[in-house]
Amino acid sequence: QQQTLPKPFIWAEPHFMVPKEKQVTICCQGNYGAVEYQLHFEGSLFAVDRPKPPERINKVKFYIPDMNSRMAGQYSCIYRVGELWSEPSNLLDLVVTEMYDTPTLSVHPGPEVISGEKVTFYCRLDTATSMFLLLKEGRSSHVQRGYGKVQAEFPLGPVTTAHRGTYRCFGSYNNHAWSFPSEPVKLLVTGDIENTSLAPEDPTFPADTWGTYLLTTETGLQKDHALWDHTAQNLLR
């Protein structure tokens, strides 16, 4: 006899990185017929939703109108059909950004390099933080973590045309509270003649997670679709 139901899926819309005082929706998708969904935050009950009618709904949305550092952390959800509860979902890391200060991102030897050259990014923030995060635009988001008292180095090693793209960095005050994003730095990598065509910067992931994050920052608009960033989510664990 089955003791628990399959775990639901959890994600954040429009993004798991939420500028402070902006809105975010945490979505939990379980099964049709679920009479109750519970959202848990750092091990405590955060919110409850009872779909109506349950047989026609398999997803609920928990709306957070005003993101702040108290709500940044790990979320999971469960659902109930009759008296039977599901397994908990995977953990969703919700990050609050635009805290305190803005770091400076620079690149050495410069933003235009030849394939095979060694490139290092430097993220600098003069306030009290020792952890830095470097993100490349695009859904894959290639997040790297670095450490330093006021500056972190991010050596990319010998670069290829796959490293082309726009980079930003954050200072991290803890795993779930990040600074404002730095100004973008666009890395241009030139290689063999056949590789220098105007190919997309991240052809595997044409949908732009960063664009959605910026949309949240600039207008507070919601996009009604799930955007996942497993790389960044796993980095936070």
Epitope: F46, Y63, M71
Partner: nanobody, 126 residues
Framework: EVQLVESGGGEVQPGGSLRLSCAAS????????MGWFRQAPGKEREFVAA???????YYAESVKGRFTISRDNAKNTVYLQMSSLRAEDTAVYYC????????????????????WGQGTLVTVKP
């Protein structure tokens, strides 16, 4: 900007009843999820009861069957009817709101609430 003003607190004997009211200013009340929290002397603030914008309710185990939360959107007011009061119910009771919200969500965690009242004192003693 939303302002919340609680009333109805006072002193009552064990087993007695009280009804707390929370009046909200502004036209956003119908789109707000509301909750009651309490803080006893020397203790942390704790969840008591909450109601969604569509009237779904949720209660702390310690008050289930004794307290009832309700709302009147026409009066921009949320109520907490308290009966069978016990000494351990003595606390300052705070009304809180999540504005705006959508659907049936009932918020239980204090971090979710973005507006708070100043509180009203309830004392239960013989």
């Amino acid at each position: 900007e939303v302002q919340l003003v609680e009333s109805g607190g006072g002193e009552v004997q064990p087993g007695g009843s009280l009804r707390l009211s929370c009046a909200a200013s502004g036209r956003t009340f119908a789109s707000a999820a509301m909750g009651w929290f309490r803080q006893a002397p020397g203790k942390e603030r704790e969840f008591v009861a909450a109601i969604s914008r569509s009237d779904d309710t949720y209660y702390a185990e310690s008050v289930k069957g004794r307290f009832t939360i309700s709302r009147d959107n026409a009066k921009n007011t949320v109520y907490l009817q308290m009966s069978s009061l016990r000494a351990e119910d003595t606390a300052v009771y705070y009304c809180a709101a999540v504005v705006p919200t959508y659907g049936n969500t009932i918020y239980v965690h204090s971090a979710a609430y973005n507006y708070w009242g100043q509180g009203t004192l309830v004392t239960v003693k013989p």
